[in-house]
């Protein structure tokens, strides 16, 4: 599979269109400060030096890793050191410490401004007026601001963006047409940058094994039908993809990618009986599909699991012979008689598996050493189950405002060094697990909260990363990739915290909150929660719960009042010495 | 704020019975989970059972399961705790808690109503 020129094989399989796009999101993603006229700029020139090496495969540097042309290129922009600082001397290393170099720099935090949406009309204009460098400006932005988002997918999210432009700007009213696709969009592609982050993260932070593992378990939840083989080798290839996107190789990513979806589609037969539909698609919906296709029904008359891997007397022997084989044919017949199980609890299983293993395959009666490890199982599933049954009930009791500001308060009180915007983002992303999870029945309800809940955990990880603050959460993100969920739920109140000092500032509210979005609004209610939390983190419930009524009368009375601001300066003192007084603070 | 009494506490041998109690007042029981927790000399308090406000739901420690039962009955403001085939590794001060969103959390921090505690000694 060796190519002369590897920009030119890539450049032939994808197409320009795509080869330009995939260059565009990977230099975004590496340089997030950079002006879109420079990246198009650098896209150009690569494109059209990719462009003389499909002419003549032997031409100059024509031969050179697409890391060394890519780096070579960002190692050109003028403001390198103003812009980014120590980035800069990434370019004096060598390959492949540069592109190393590059994705440690990374930042999952940027500081760029919030995308603001202009009037539909206005965005209607600019994709008329030049349709491609409207769709450039989509990768650019989303690629900037999620620079691990998964390169592939986001064409086909820039696909799906052009179908509603397309359509919508000659619809009767724009806006109906437009601002609901967009917020699909919008909501959807957060989600999809954080699952795959957590996919990077998994591979960067605890190695190839744990996403294999991962992938294992959820492969063969979805694909029960097909043989270990076939699932090893889908998991192999999968892993390649994904190591390739998180490791900035987004053209080799996305042609494998799509390699991957062919294999899989001519080979459906013996894979899932659901993937008909998915493999009539083009490229980029194919792909998608596949990745999102329904669990496949389980065999009939599946033998149980104790046969081989606790009554058989060759436990230990097939185990030696080659341990993570076994382990992954464990989780393989494990996974795909439990699509009612999260990944991270079957992961779990396997763990507590391969432990009694190495425990009891050294002692001197090994089958009655690991004759009751099934026993073992009964708790870790009961945890997350039960945990699940109380937060949807609490879920449905409070309505899914509420219920994130339970969370709110709960890892306030956890974690309080944590910033106040973070605290307030991952509580909410938290709380929307019952919006998500909780209307599905008992058999649906663990894989979609907890392997969710983990996405949401690896983001307050990935973002704490960055300034940590917090022993306890370094320690809950780094000792176990699949304890994550049960660490955080263990922790108690954080007895060596001090509270922070009042800031009457922090509780001083304008009226310019009347004309939020209830979105918006929300949030700033649930920053001054956080607050409160911070400097009385022994605050009961109730307390909390009271001046969060008192505040929301408050925010609804000065937004209906004729003089607003004075309002809320007035009924705002008001409310700060009634809270304080409530409180004790 | 609710107020928490608990009873029943005592000197019991390894394989014997009790029944804690505990009563509350103040407020609307009936809108709270209560949980009981226990501290042994020298460990952290750790959670033991609770038992959410319709008492629908019941959750345990693994420690304790099938030897101890959370009741409640709501008529009386009282949550029990009835301790069977009880083992020295059982001795500690046993607490009432409660939680005004009434689901039954494991965890402490949900409980912002505690009780003074009662001893249990189960002796060998």
């Known amino acids: 599979d060796a190519h002369k020129s590897e920009v030119a094989h890539r450049f032939k399989d994808l197409g320009e269109e795509n080869f330009k796009a995939l260059v565009l999101i990977a230099f975004a993603q590496y340089l997030q400060q950079c002006p879109f006229e420079d990246h198009v700029k650098l896209v150009n020139e690569v494109t059209e030096f990719a462009k003389t090496c499909v002419a003549d495969e032997s031409a100059e540097n024509c031969d050179k890793s697409l890391h060394t042309l890519f780096g070579d290129k960002l190692c050109t922009v003028a403001t390198l050191r103003e812009t980014y600082g120590e980035m800069a001397d990434c370019c004096a290393k060598q390959e492949p410490e540069r592109n190393e170099c590059f994705l440690q720099h990374k930042d999952d935090n940027p500081n760029l401004p919030r995308l603001v949406r202009p009037e539909v009309d206005v965005m209607c204009t600019a994709f008329h007026d030049n349709e491609e460098t409207f769709l450039k400006k989509y990768l650019y932005e989303i690629a900037r601001r999620h620079p691990y988002f998964y390169a592939p997918e986001l064409l086909f999210f820039a696909k799906r963006y052009k179908a509603a432009f397309t359509e919508c700007c000659q619809a009767a009213d724009k806006a109906a047409c437009l601002l609901p696709k967009l917020d699909e969009l919008r909501d959807e592609g957060k989600a999809s940058s954080a699952k795959q982050r957590l996919k990077c993260a998994s591979l960067q932070k605890f190695g190839e094994r744990a996403f294999k593992a991962w992938a294992v378990a959820r492969l063969s939840q979805r694909f029960p039908k097909a043989e270990f083989a076939e699932v090893s080798k889908l998991v192999t290839d999968l892993t390649k993809v994904h190591t390739e996107c998180c490791h900035g190789d987004l053209l080799e990513c996305a042609d494998d990618r799509a390699d991957l979806a062919k294999y899989i589609c001519e080979n459906q037969d013996s894979i899932s009986s659901k993937l008909k539909e998915c493999c009539e698609k083009p490229l980029l919906e194919k792909s998608h599909c596949i990745a999102e296709v329904e669990n496949d029904e389980m065999p009939a008359d599946l033998p149980s699991l104790a046969a081989d891997f606790v009554e058989s007397k060759d436990v230990c022997k097939n185990y030696a012979e080659a341990k993570d084989v076994f382990l992954g044919m464990f989780l393989y017949e494990y996974a795909r008689r439990h699509p009612d199980y999260s990944v991270v609890l079957l992961l779990r299983l396997a763990k507590t598996y391969e432990t009694t293993l190495e425990k009891c395959c050294a002692a001197a009666d090994p089958h009655e050493c690991y004759a009751k490890v099934f026993d073992e199982f009964k708790p870790l599933v009961e945890e997350p189950q039960n945990l699940i049954k109380q937060n949807c009930e609490l879920f449905e009791q409070l309505g899914e405002y509420k219920f994130q500001n339970a969370l709110l308060v709960r890892y306030t009180k956890k974690v309080p060094q944590v910033s106040t915007p973070t605290l307030v983002e991952v509580s909410r992303n938290l709380g929307k697990v019952g919006s998500k999870c909780c209307k599905h029945p008992e058999a649906k309800r663990m894989p979609c909260a907890e392997d969710y809940l983990s996405v949401v955990l690896n983001q307050l990880c990935v973002l704490h990363e960055k300034t940590p603050v917090s022993d306890r959460v370094t320690k809950c993100c780094t000792e176990s990739l699949v304890n994550r969920r049960p660490c955080f739920s263990a922790l108690e109140v954080d007895e060596t915290y001090v509270p922070k000092e009042f800031n009457a500032e922090t509780f001083t509210f304008h009226a310019d909150i009347c004309t939020l979005s209830e979105k918006e609004r929300q949030i700033k209610k649930q920053t001054a929660l956080v607050e409160l939390v911070k400097h009385k983190p022994k605050a009961t419930k109730e307390q909390l719960k009271a001046v969060m009524d008192d505040f929301a009368a408050f925010v609804e009375k000065c937004c209906k009042a004729d003089d607003k601001e004075t309002c809320f300066a007035e009924e705002g003192k008001k409310l700060v010495a009634a809270s304080q007084a409530a409180l004790g603070l | 704020h609710v107020q928490l009494v608990e009873s029943g506490g005592g000197l019991v041998q390894t394989g014997g019975s009790l029944r804690l109690a505990c009563a509350a007042s103040?407020?609307?029981?009936?809108?709270?989970?209560m949980g009981w927790f226990r501290q042994a000399p020298g460990k952290e308090r750790e959670f033991v059972a609770s038992?959410?406000?319709?008492?629908?739901?019941?959750y345990y420690a693994d420690s304790v399961k099938g030897r101890f039962t959370i009741s409640r009955d709501n008529g009386k403001d009282t949550v029990y705790l009835q301790m069977n085939r009880l083992i020295p590794e059982d001795t500690a001060v046993y607490y009432c808690a409660a939680d005004s969103e009434g689901v039954g959390f494991r965890n402490m921090l949900e409980y912002d109503y505690w009780g003074q505690g009662t001893q249990v000694t189960v002796s060998s």
């Open positions: 103040g407020r609307a029981f009936s809108t709270y989970a």
């Open positions: 038992i959410n406000r319709s008492g629908s739901s019941t």
